[in-house]
């Protein structure tokens, strides 16, 4: 389970455009062994983006998240800065992958589907802990995400690494309870599901889920990127992870060269990912999109799939 401590398993070749720190909940640094240093930002919607640590907005965002983490600690929350091998997060189960990301599987397994079960990690996240932080990075927990420019005009020019599926129930939250807010993001053309970040202790009532509706492409999301237009995303869902295509839909069209390599270390059977898989069905990549990697989801700590559409996710709940 503990693969090479020094191996670089997240490399970024394309950096995201600016993201409001209000949309971020966490950051981590990739390892020195990756050569090109990058900050991995996690948004309220549990999407990961590569960011350039030399950019002022990234420095400001990290500083802001550090302050928030310190405040959480002072207020009774716990926070761990972890330094060491970057392991895959065990919390997420499914997600969208941006074209600049490639998975480098390190093992194969016998089953082709991942069925994570919920755990107490949501509650831990809500209380400010970071149980699923990859070790091997310097990280910080912060708060929530989202803005939206004009009518569907693309997303941050960035590299979304993974995305965790959301739930579609609504709950009541008392303002006095600590929590990590829900989703909000710019970068994807077609979904805006919410992650299951509800704090059970504050969930007063659960509303019924909405009936599936027609999807407006990139509804709920506008874009930070400068004028790039998103390509409408197909409803990307799959059960078996075959070749993983570059996932650029909501971003600028990047060439095949703009990929980040992500080596995902297998998760042991004791791992308890805390979210339900978002995808089922199959999907064929568009011909013009280069195929970057293949992998066996059974052994991956992070199941990476192109981002599914929100209503499809709702139908599966």
């Amino acid at each position: 389970q503990h693969h090479g401590v020094t191996k670089c398993n997240i490399t970024c070749s394309k950096m995201t455009s600016k993201i409001p720190v209000a949309l971020l909940i966490h950051y981590q640094q990739n390892q020195a062994s990756c050569g090109k240093r990058a900050i991995i930002l996690e948004t309220r919607q549990h999407r990961l983006f590569c960011a350039d640590p030399k950019e002022q907005w990234v420095k400001d965002a990290m500083q802001h998240l550090d302050r928030q983490a310190a405040a959480l600690t002072r207020n009774g929350g716990t926070f761990e800065k972890q330094i060491g091998e970057v392991k895959p997060r065990t919390t997420p189960a499914a997600g969208g992958m941006d074209e600049s990301v490639v998975l480098e599987p390190e093992a194969t397994g016998e089953s082709s589907s991942l069925e994570p079960t919920p755990s107490s990690q949501e509650a831990q996240r809500a209380l400010g802990t970071s149980p699923e932080l990859p070790t091997g990075v310097t990280g910080s927990s912060g708060t929530r995400l989202p803005p939206t420019p004009k009518a569907q005009d693309g997303g941050p020019v960035g590299t979304e690494l993974f995305r965790v599926p959301p739930v579609s129930t609504a709950a009541t939250w008392q303002s006095s309870a600590p929590h990590q807010p829900g989703p909000s993001l710019w970068a994807e053309a077609k979904t805006s599901e919410a992650p299951s970040t509800q704090d059970p202790s504050t969930q007063a009532s659960t509303a019924s889920s909405p009936a599936p509706e027609e999807n407006a492409p990139s509804e709920g999301q506008r874009v930070w990127g400068q004028g790039q237009s998103p390509r409408p995303e197909n409803s990307l869902e799959r059960e078996e992870m075959g070749p993983v295509p570059a996932h650029t839909d909501a971003f600028q069209d990047w060439g095949p060269g703009s990929m980040a390599h992500v080596s995902v270390v297998p998760v042991s059977s004791e791992g308890t990912p805390s979210r339900e898989p978002v995808a089922s069905g199959s999907w064929t990549p568009k011909a013009e999109e280069p195929i970057h990697a293949t992998m066996d989801p059974q052994r991956l700590g992070v199941l990476i799939t192109p981002v599914p559409d929100a209503q499809a996710a709702t139908r599966r709940q």
Epitope: P20, A22, P149, S184, E219
Partner: antibody, heavy 119, light 107 residues
Framework: QVQLVQSGAEVKKPGASVKVSCKAS????????IHWVRQAPGQGLEWIGW????????KFNERFKGRTTMTADTSTSTAYMELSSLRSEDTAVYFC????????????WGQGTTVTVSS | DIQMTQSPSSLSASVGDRVTITCRAS??????LAWYQQKPGKAPKFLVY???TLADGVPSRFSGSGSGTQYTLTISSLQPEDFATYFC?????????FGGGTKVEIK
């Protein structure tokens, strides 16, 4: 077209609570945030917090923590904001506003609900 | 918290005038700024986000610019329907904060 329709004016006594509703239509309710913003008479705008109807998660301005509850009913596409322990300085027009998931600006607003707190 | 300071608090102008409203943030908000227009008794109307991107349906006489802590909203040729109060809002970090408003009145 996108519309946010709020409940009617309320007059409350100090110490009481008020619950304002905001019914959304014309878009997928669970795909956007609902923010609450207030405006005291002749004053500027003050952000109270948001709720994400997709999962019910909220975020509050620290100034309102502890006496604000936000809820969302996805079956009726309605968001609610309840403010308790009212004081005279809570007299204001309360607006709900839709926020995209890529940033917290407010692209559509409800018409406002006037809340008057007076003994 | 980031404080937003708008200037001037009010101005008088005539139809056809070029009007500039300034918003200064107490910290770097990295262009995550929105502008709204509000008329008496009405809800604010969304004009601009990300410092310079016009919202749908907003006339091109409106434009935004700026960076760091200093931002401006310009109306190139004031129209009768533009007489209103304008607010800026930062959405870089929570709590989201608004400027105090600039009232544009008829001269």
């Amino acid at each position: 077209q996108v519309q946010l329709v709020q409940s009617g004016a309320e007059v409350k006594k100090p110490g009481a609570s008020v619950k304002v509703s905001c019914k959304a239509s014309g878009y997928t309710f669970t795909n956007y945030y609902i923010h609450w913003v207030r405006q005291a008479p002749g004053q500027g705008l003050e952000w109270i917090g948001w709720i994400y109807p997709g999962d019910g998660s909220p975020k509050f301005n620290e100034r309102f923590k502890g006496r604000t509850t936000m809820t969302a009913d996805t079956s009726t596409s309605t968001a609610y904001m309840e403010l308790s322990s009212l004081r005279s300085e809570d007299t204001a027009v309360y607006f709900c506003a839709r926020g995209p998931t890529d940033g917290d600006y407010f692209d559509y607003w409800g018409q406002g609900t006037t809340v008057t707190v007076s003994s | 918290d980031i404080q937003m300071t708008q200037s001037p608090s009010s101005l008088s102008a005539s139809v056809g005038d070029r009007v500039t409203i300034t918003c200064r943030a107490s910290g770097n908000i990295h262009n995550f700024l929105a502008w709204y227009q509000q008329k008496p008794g009405k809800a604010p109307k969304f004009l601009v986000y990300n410092e310079k991107t016009l919202a749908d349906g907003v006339p091109s006489r409106f434009s935004g610019s700026g960076s760091g802590t200093q931002y401006t909203l310009t109306i190139s040729s004031l129209q009768p329907e533009d007489f209103a109060t304008y607010f800026c809002q930062q959405f870089w970090s929570t709590p989201y904060t608004f400027g105090g408003g600039t009232k544009v009145e008829i001269k």
